[in-house]
Amino acid sequence: DAEFRHDSGYEVHHQKLVFFAEDVGSNKGAIIGLMVGGVVIA
């Protein structure tokens, strides 16, 4: 059976993303998210 370890050599990159709230609605200010492995999670 294959054994999967957290430190098996795969590196997960994360990056902060900033969007303007008014691009998606009427609010002002910035929306800050986090992209992990190509997926925005927050």
Epitope: L17, V18, F20, E22, D23, V24, K28
Partner: nanobody
Framework: EVQLVESGGGLVQAGGSLRLSCVAS????????MGWFRQAPGKEREFVAA????????YYTDSVKGRFTISRDSSKNTVYLQMNSLKPEDTADYYC?????????????????WGQGTQVTVSS
């Protein structure tokens, strides 16, 4: 043809001020969030500040908060970067860029159009 033309750079002593301007042509100005980036010698280009399409929202990198102010004048298709309390570490080429609304404003790759840059040198 889309053009972004920066001006206002120069040599200034530490503690001084400069105002950069960027005139946009060939695009629908109201459809684009506008940003300023900078690139110091030997370093990667980095985000400085951005302003929303309406001008109602702004965002700054931590190192310039309270010192730099971004603004825009839609009647002149121009975006400005007022830089106060300049430091030697602000020395760089400064670039104006345009990103379609909905883009992540702090990522270089999200910006569709770029100017040629204007040089800012802060001496100690």
């Amino acid at each position: 043809e889309v053009q972004l033309v920066e001006s206002g750079g120069g040599l200034v002593q530490a503690g001084g001020s400069l105002r950069l301007s960027c005139v946009a042509s060939g695009l629908t100005f109201s459809s684009y969030n506008m940003g300023w980036f900078r690139q110091a010698p030997g370093k990667e280009r980095e985000f400085v500040a951005a302003i929303s399409r309406s001008g109602g929202s702004t965002y700054y990198t931590d190192s310039v908060k309270g010192r730099f102010t971004i603004s825009r004048d839609s009647s002149k298709n121009t975006v400005y970067l007022q830089m106060n309390s300049l430091k030697p570490e602000d020395t760089a080429d400064y670039y104006c860029a345009a990103a379609l609304f909905g883009s992540a404003i702090n990522l270089l790759s999200e910006y569709r159009y770029w100017g040629q840059g204007t040089q800012v040198t802060v001496s100690s």
